[in-house]
């Protein structure tokens, strides 16, 4: 904390300008009026204050606004945002998307910091849901943002927001998250025709159930192996050899390279070897001819 000393004669700041970069910390504390700083916050970011000087300016704002800064000040924090703690940010009420964008811009190119995570949390909670414009903004700055949310948090994403999602935004999502997002995507894209629909829904298919995969297999979609490998194992297992062949189209040849990996490995174990042989890929591990397959789970359900 900078000790309180009187401002030297002639150094009282009449406006926030470049001359202040020559002030020592104690001079900033003594000579810059907090109310002046608050009204001219938009100038601070353009002035190359050192991080130590920014500490002093933050201290002045903290004294002026002990209950949290007003949005008019928050919007113009610029580099001063980097000095804020999550505790500081929890006192804020950020409602404007422009404010959110301005602060995310300061942190651009860096990992999501605890400050940014807190800011986003405050913003989204204030809005009540992740609307399209917010999601657009967040994924533009942090492509992995969507996958950092819990399934519960994702449930507040309206289907209309799904249009903002790009394939790379889902790269780090796990199956639990895709289970929540897939039905929303299906709803969002329901009015599109076959090929366009597949292009849009493709990145969400890790949450698709068996019946939807069967339906896709009837539409000549030619799913690539990378997408197939991300499908839920439990959704792939009931598919027949013919259905997988239709689903993958010319990409079916890629199954050979993936035969030891899930879900291909588990799917192979469920197919008749005769049927697998029809693919001509040399896939091994299917059920030998003449063997009877009992579905014990079905038997238990009946008894």
């Amino acid at each position: 904390e900078v000790e309180k000393t009187a401002c030297p004669s002639g150094k009282k700041a009449r406006e926030i300008d470049e001359s202040l970069i020559f002030y020592k910390k104690w001079e900033l504390e003594a000579c810059v009026d907090a109310a002046l700083l608050a009204t001219q916050m938009d100038r601070v970011n353009a002035i190359p204050f050192t991080y130590e000087q920014l500490d002093v300016l933050k201290h002045k704002l903290d004294e002026l606004y002990p209950q949290g800064y007003p949005e008019s000040v928050i919007q113009h924090l610029g580099y001063l945002f980097l000095k804020m703690s999550p505790e500081d940010i929890r006192k804020w009420n950020v409602t404007s998307l422009e404010t959110l964008k301005a602060l995310l811009e300061v942190n651009k190119g860096h990992e999501m910091s605890p400050q940014v995570a807190t800011l986003i949390d405050r913003f989204v909670k204030g809005r009540g849901q992740l609307d399209k414009d917010t999601l657009d903004t967040l994924t533009a700055f942090y492509p992995g943002y969507l996958c950092s949310l819990s399934p519960e948090e994702l449930s507040s994403v309206p289907p209309s927001s799904i249009w903002a999602v790009r394939p790379q935004d889902l790269d780090t999502c796990d199956p639990r998250q895709l289970d929540v997002l897939y039905p929303k995507a299906r709803l969002a894209f329901q009015n599109m025709n076959g090929s366009e629909y597949f292009v849009k829904i493709q990145s969400f298919l890790g949450g698709a159930p068996t019946e939807d995969l069967k339906a896709l297999s009837q539409q000549n979609v030619s799913m690539d192996l990378a997408t197939f490998m991300k499908l839920r194992t439990d959704a792939v297992l009931p598919l027949t050899v013919a259905e997988v062949q239709k689903l993958l189209g010319p990409h079916v040849e890629g199954l050979k390279a993936e035969e030891r990996h899930r879900p291909v490995r588990d799917w192979i174990l469920r197919q008749r070897q005769d049927d697998l042989d029809t693919l001509g890929l040399g896939l091994q591990g299917g059920i030998p001819n003449g063997y009877l397959v009992l579905d014990l789970s079905m038997q238990e359900a009946l008894s």
Epitope: P48, F49, T50, Y51, E52, Q53, L54, Y79
Partner: nanobody
Framework: EVQIVESGGGSVQAGETLRLSCTAS????????MGWYRQAPGDECELVST???????NYADSVKGRFTISQDNAKNTVYLQMTSLKPEDTAIYSC?????????WGQGTLVTVS
Amino acid sequence: EVQIVESGGGSVQAGETLRLSCTASGFTFDDSDMGWYRQAPGDECELVSTISSDGSTNYADSVKGRFTISQDNAKNTVYLQMTSLKPEDTAIYSCRTMASRIGCWGQGTLVTVS
């Protein structure tokens, strides 16, 4: 990687002259505003002088009329010509891009005026 090397410091008598040099690499020098900072023993960091990419200069009140900042873009070097030195100019002098917002940090070059 941004690298900055300051040199030219030393011990002099009051009233004498020194010229500090700061050679930089790892960034576009002629697009950058540069500054000389100093920190005296037991005191806090202070900005002494700045030079912007267009060549305009600014000085702290305490050195106006005695210090001159200049740059040679071809050599990626900023200079601080210090005349009429006083004992209160004794400090470690550091050179920085203003955009770094770091101030007094790193090696610097020591100037001692007796």
